[in-house]
């Protein structure tokens, strides 16, 4: 499978709500014996492998945001401290994977990188990842909501292993 | 019957090396996860590492750069080579086989002293 | 790095007690990665629990598992004579890295 970034980068007022998302593309496999971890976390440009570094999201690391489920199932954080800051990210069944921001403020600015791990545990993992741009700007040439441009099919698909 | 032995344990000096093996008998090495862990003298059990099915390999994070786990599947046994050991790798090393979401068989161990 | 935290470390109790064991792991583990192990001297481990509340083939249903997140017990309903041991946990992880960690271990003493 793949991860697409449908949207590579999201322009948002201060205050604002924003959701961040990724999407599983391709043949999933959905075994008993599968399992997904799926989490989110900040990085930044100019590495030589996108997303190689670990940095977290309003002080919550990887393993805070993290959900890990069966390959047939849904989840969402449903903890204090990922709500307390203002996080929840969240699972579907269709291979939507995202992160809720609330109350963005100007330090929320940056790279975020969704990882995806494929876990047939003992036999195999398969690691993915995608990577957006989150701008969050003030002032009046601040927009009144979010803006988000999609990604290149390219970019969208452009998968390097994490 | 399915059964791990390990074996060359022994002796060592420190900054010596040693290659531990893990035959199995009674079923396929090359179908399960095979890991080693070892218990010092009196103290609790300690993960070394694993080689999964797909021969991923993944070592706890002392054990980088000294152990190197291998399998060699037409002589269904399993290796951990020890390099730059020292007296606190002194231990009983088991090799353990993954089964399911565990491990589920393990050896008997062998004993490995480093000492002057 | 990835504790396994295990609790108390000694338990001393009498054949017919209710034993409790506690394992608390410092990030969260997927419960089906979660076992417990017995130990008696000069022996290997064995497999008691997995997927934190499953029973291994051979063990007898005195033995329980439970928890999930962090948070994992085994309890032994009553004590019998051969359970007299030492105890561990055990929890894989795959974040960042493949790790297995084992807990401390608790031992189960006669009173």
């Known amino acids: 499978f793949k991860v697409a970034t449908p949207y590579s980068l999201y322009v948002c007022p201060e205050g604002q709500n924003v959701t961040l998302t990724c999407r599983l593309l391709g043949p999933v496999d959905k075994g008993h014996d599968v399992t997904f971890y799926k989490t989110w976390y900040r990085s930044s440009r100019g590495e030589v492998q996108t997303c190689s570094e670990r940095r977290p999201i309003r002080n919550l690391t990887f393993q805070d945001l993290h959900l890990h489920h069966g390959g047939h199932q849904a989840a969402n954080t449903s903890h204090d401290l990922a709500q307390r800051h203002g996080l929840e990210s969240a699972s579907d069944h269709h291979g939507n994977f995202s992160i809720t921001m609330r109350n963005l403020t100007l330090l929320d600015s940056g790279l975020y990188c969704c990882l995806v791990v494929e876990i047939r545990h003992h036999h195999s993992e398969h690691r993915v990842h995608g990577a957006m741009e989150l701008q969050v700007q003030t002032g009046k040439d601040a927009p009144s909501n979010c803006v988000v441009y999609p990604s290149s099919s390219q970019d969208s698909e452009n998968i390097t292993a994490a | 019957e399915v059964q791990l032995v390990e074996s060359g344990g022994g002796l060592v000096q420190p900054g010596g090396s040693l290659r531990l093996s893990c035959a199995a008998s009674g079923f396929s090495l090359s179908s399960y996860a095979m890991g080693w862990v070892r218990q010092a003298p009196g103290k609790g059990l300690e993960w070394v590492g694993i080689?999964?099915?797909?021969?991923?390999?993944y070592y706890a994070s002392w054990a980088k750069g000294r152990f190197t786990i291998s399998r060699d599947n037409s002589k269904n046994t399993l290796y951990l080579q020890m390099n730059s050991l020292r007296a606190e790798d002194t231990a009983v090393y088991y090799c353990?086989?993954?089964?399911?979401?565990?491990?589920?068989?393990w050896g008997q161990g062998t004993l490995v002293t480093v000492s002057s | 790095e990835i504790v396994m935290t295990q609790s108390p470390a000694t338990l001393s109790l009498s054949p017919g007690e209710r034993a409790t064991l506690s394992c608390q792991a410092s990030?969260?583990?997927?419960?089906?990665?979660l076992a417990w192990y017995q130990q008696k001297p000069g022996q290997a481990p064995r497999l008691l629990i997995y997927?934190?509340?499953t029973l291994a083939s051979g063990i007898p249903a005195r033995f329980s598992g439970s928890g999930s997140g962090t948070d994992f017990t085994l309890t032994i309903s009553s004590l019998q004579p051969e359970d007299f041991a030492v105890y561990y946990c055990q929890g894989t992880f795959y974040i960042p890295d493949y790790i297995d960690g084992f807990g401390g271990g608790t031992k189960v003493e006669i009173k």
């Open positions: 990030q969260s583990v997927y419960s089906r990665y």
């Open positions: 353990a086989r993954g089964d399911g979401y565990t491990y589920g068989l």
């Open positions: 997927s934190a509340s």
């Open positions: 080689i999964i099915v797909s021969g991923n390999i």
